[in-house]
């Protein structure tokens, strides 16, 4: 029950996180005009990853896309790439995790497969979250550098007769959305990885002992999660699921993880 809850919660948290990463990537307010200690202009400038916008005092807003690819700063391209990679990995992770959810039954999918899929999606979410956090942090660092450079220009560039109104940019709402969303995706991924451990049964160093009753065979497996009754299919003590208790032959054939301790 706890495993299902952890997996489900991990999925939901990751879903919210990835939605946030997508929202942040699409938002125009990655950097906004700094209004503090600046000449008050009648226009408000803000910029995103894909376009820059100017809002007039009337509220009229005009946005222009960055129609060049080669002319854009390498850092901006890198941030775009990180965010897109984050979204793609997150989307694939979501797709994989839907099939991995314990509460959803798809055909005769074994729990071991679900465990592997849960782990895969968890890792994808972690990488997705890290990509988003990295992208936002790179952009934030770029802003801080430019902010102090333009501040220095404001106070050193006054030698000439003509002054310029320096437009300094500070952190926009998208950065905070991105950081939070990346964090949520990361947390969701960690939760999925934790859930995976619960889904995959622990291997044991006990050898399975078979007791053959006269009527029908019952395999008693001390370290296992299930006892197999001899009705129907499992009369020959075949393994019940990967990573679970094994028959005497199998334990001898394949070393247990405990053998390496």
């Amino acid at each position: 029950m706890a495993v299902t809850a952890c997996q489900g919660l991990g999925f939901v948290v990751s879903l919210i996180g990835i939605a946030g990463i997508i929202a942040a990537t699409c938002m125009d307010q990655w950097s906004t005009q700094d209004l503090y200690n600046n000449p008050v202009t009648a226009v408000f400038n803000y910029q995103g990853l894909w376009r820059s916008c100017v809002r007039e005092s009337s509220g009229f807003t005009e946005c222009r896309g960055y129609f060049t690819l080669l002319g854009l700063p390498a850092m901006l391209q890198a941030v775009r790439a990180l965010m897109i990679v984050g979204i793609v990995l997150g989307a694939i992770g979501l797709l994989v995790s839907i099939f991995a959810l314990k509460c959803i039954r798809i055909g005769s999918m074994e729990d071991s497969a679900k465990a592997n899929m849960t782990l895969t999606s968890g890792i994808m979410f972690i990488v997705s979250g890290l990509c988003a956090i990295a992208g936002v942090s790179v952009f934030a660092n770029m802003l801080v550098t430019n902010f102090w450079m333009s501040t220095a220009n404001m106070y050193t560039g006054m030698g000439g007769m003509v002054q310029t109104v320096q437009t300094r940019y500070t952190f926009g709402a998208a950065l905070f959305v991105g950081w939070v969303a990346g964090g949520l995706t990361l947390i969701g991924g960690v939760m999925m990885c934790i859930a995976c451990r619960g889904l995959a049964p622990e291997e044991t160093n006990y050898k399975a002992v078979s007791y053959h009753a006269s009527g029908h065979s019952v395999a008693y497996k001390p370290g296992g999660f299930k006892a197999s009754t001899g009705f129907g299919s499992n009369t020959k003590n075949k393994k019940i699921y990967d990573g679970g208790a094994r028959t005497e032959d199998e334990v001898q054939s394949y070393p247990s993880k405990h053998d390496y301790v």
Epitope: P39, A42, V43, N45, S58, V162, V165
Partner: antibody, heavy 119, light 113 residues
């Protein structure tokens, strides 16, 4: 077509106050900034300040802070400018002007109110 | 405050002539965000309120004859009347509508011979 109606003239005594009105018709009053401009004979135009009727947000020229107070009455589509502690320096033509939607320029102007400060 | 300096203060021309008037600002009025210059030109005929002619330095207001042309960038701006008509007799004001407080030039008075 937007029209801004202002009273033609106001005669006031020194030290007194005057409230100049500007009634807008033919547009969504709350959307656009309403600016006030002063024009003295032989001098250039001076921007006093502006008010956005939607939220009563104001911007003043620091030169006129304490002198002019801008208000709006959304119900009657009217903007007001109150000038206090009047002196002969305040004798001028006062225009109200409505800001454009697409830019910060003043698209529509009232005919102006001549304020005369005289004992 | 940004100071707007207009020149000449007045000029007298004959109808059909080309007229150039200048406006210089003490600070750049170019907004880096959209590469627009926030300078507006107004025409004020005797006994009338000002009328919007040109915004963003070079965008003509609807209904304004195409003989009026605005140009310039940063701190230097120009209003050109390609062929002056008798009805163009007026004072022309340039305005900074970029940085608060908005400021106007002292005006250029155009007189017709």
């Amino acid at each position: 077509q937007v029209q801004l109606q202002q009273p033609g003239a106001e005669l006031v005594k020194p030290g007194a106050s005057v409230k100049v009105s500007c009634k807008a018709s033919g547009s969504t009053f709350t959307t656009y900034w309403m600016h006030w401009v002063k024009k003295r004979p032989g001098q250039g135009l001076e921007w006093i300040g502006g008010i956005r009727p939607f939220d009563s947000n104001t911007n003043y020229n620091h030169k006129f802070k304490g002198k002019a107070t801008l208000t709006v009455d959304k119900a009657s589509n009217t903007a007001y400018m109150q000038l206090s502690s009047l002196t002969s320096e305040d004798s001028a033509v006062y225009y109200c002007a409505m800001g454009a939607y697409y830019s910060n320029s003043f698209a529509y102007w009232g005919q102006g109110t001549v304020v005369t400060v005289s004992a | 405050d940004i100071v707007m300096t207009q020149s000449p203060s007045s000029l007298t021309v004959t109808p059909g002539e080309k007229v150039t008037m200048n406006c210089k600002s003490s600070q750049s009025l170019l907004n880096s965000g959209n590469q627009k210059n926030y300078v507006t030109w107004y025409q004020q005929k005797p006994g009338q309120p000002p009328k919007l002619l040109m915004f963003w330095a070079s965008t003509r207001e609807s209904g304004v004859p195409d003989r009026f042309t605005g140009s310039g960038s940063g701190t230097d701006f120009t209003l050109i009347i390609s062929s002056v008509q008798a009805e163009d007799l007026a004072v022309y004001h340039c305005q900074n509508d970029y940085v608060y407080p908005f400021t106007f030039g002292s005006g250029t008075k155009l007189e017709i011979k």
